[in-house]
Interface confidence: low
């Protein structure tokens, strides 16, 4: 036998004290799928939450982060402090990032300046509290004749001759 | 037949936390709210908050920093904790089913706390 | 929060008279109100949802009326059962609130 419920589309719920009569849901509430027995409440975005889409009969509110935070966990559950470049967030605010670490985003933690060695690289720029060291070539990636650690001489000036 | 039965502790001392359960049969919990409802002695009713199918929870903004609702559906359980328990605590507790259009139609028999040293 | 005030908080009546219990919203809340009868011992029961639907199983003697924020919860024949309290709770916003009650006594 068909369940009666069955029958009652997103947006609305089975009132089973009504012989299963499918009822509208009540305001700021939604079902978004069909023979739902309740609706769920709608999301209120409140405080640092701002609202991006409204609730409607059908589907939830969804929330984002008022400038100046950003969102953290599923369906942006909690807003969290930005920071600076350079900087992460603890909990006495935000901080630079220690010697040796880096931050190129507004949110997450410092993170360590690769180290280029491990790759037998060298450094070629160095790193800063907003950017990753840049890694040189290693030896075996340059072409014969460019490993001479001697640096080239400099180009001369047109229009002048060597004294 | 749907039923709801309320289990607590009966006598808990100021400032601890109160933790009672709320045990449903014939009706799920991934289809129903849960709705807590207290009276304190000579008093009327008062709204604590509801837990919905989904699991999210409201609660009333008086007590909100002391109210954690909380529910095992493979259990058909639903739990009340509150902390920081004071004498203007000592009530009887109440969970009541929420259905669709959000009236209580199934309530437990309810279960008495006395908050005392 | 929405504030709901019923009056009077306690009633005497005679068997067999009308009664009428008046529940006041401190804003518009639409139809959205709720009537439950709390007998001597405890026990919670639904009357009414949604102002004026009879939940399954009430006499009805039983009815409701309003809407905004003037509500009325009528019994049209009190019998002795109807010894209790009466509550009206609203839902057009959370948090849900109850009134103050009204006792009902037998004269």
């Known amino acids: 036998l068909q369940d009666p419920c069955s029958n009652c589309p997103a947006g609305t719920f089975c009132d089973n004290n009504r012989n299963q009569i499918c009822s509208p849901c009540p305001p700021n509430s939604f079902s978004s799928a069909g023979g739902q027995r309740t609706c769920d409440i709608c999301r209120q975005c409140k405080g640092v939450f701002r609202t991006r889409k409204e609730c409607s009969s059908t589907s939830n509110a969804e929330c984002d982060c008022t400038p100046g935070f950003h969102c953290l966990g599923a369906g942006c559950s909690r807003c969290e402090q930005d920071c600076k470049q350079g900087q992460e967030l603890t909990k006495k605010g935000c901080k630079d990032c220690c010697f040796g670490t880096f931050n190129d985003q507004k949110r997450g933690i410092c993170r360590p300046w690769t180290n280029c060695s491990l790759d037998g690289k060298s450094v070629l720029v160095n790193g800063t509290k907003e950017r990753d060291v840049v890694c040189g070539p290693s030896p075996a990636d340059l072409s014969p004749g460019a490993s001479s650690v001697t640096p080239p001489a400099p180009a001369r000036e047109p229009g002048h001759s060597p004294q | 037949q749907v039923q709801l039965q309320e289990s607590g502790p009966g006598l808990v001392k100021p400032s601890e936390t109160l933790s009672i359960t709320c045990t449903v049969s014939?009706?799920?919990?991934?289809?129903?709210?849960v709705h807590w409802v207290r009276q304190p002695p000579g008093k009327g009713l008062e709204g604590l908050g509801v837990?919905?199918?989904?699991?999210?929870?409201n609660y009333n903004s008086a007590l909100m920093s002391r109210l954690t609702i909380s529910k095992d559906n493979s259990k058909s359980q639903v739990s009340l904790k509150m902390s920081s328990l004071t004498a203007a605590d000592t009530a009887m507790y109440y969970c009541a089913r929420v259905t669709g259009t959000w009236y209580f139609d199934v309530w437990g028999q309810g279960t008495t706390v006395t908050v005392s040293s | 929060d929405i504030q709901m005030t019923q009056s009077p908080s306690s009633l005497s009546a005679s068997l067999g008279d009308r009664v009428t219990i008046s529940c006041s919203a401190s804003?518009?809340?639409?139809?959205?109100l709720n009537w439950y009868q709390q007998k001597p011992d405890g026990t919670v029961k639904l009357l009414i949802y949604?102002?004026?639907t009879l939940h399954s199983g009430v006499p009805s003697r039983f009815s409701g009326s309003g809407s905004g924020t003037d509500f009325t919860l009528t019994i049209s024949s009190l019998q002795p059962e109807d010894v209790a309290t009466y509550y009206c709770?609203?839902?057009?916003?959370?948090?849900?609130?109850f009134g103050g009650g009204t006792k009902l006594e037998i004269k």
């Open positions: 804003q518009g809340i639409s139809n959205y």
């Open positions: 014939g009706s799920s919990l991934t289809s129903y709210g």
């Open positions: 949604y102002t004026s």
């Open positions: 709770q609203q839902y057009s916003k959370l948090p849900w609130t």
């Open positions: 837990i919905w199918p989904g699991g999210s929870t």
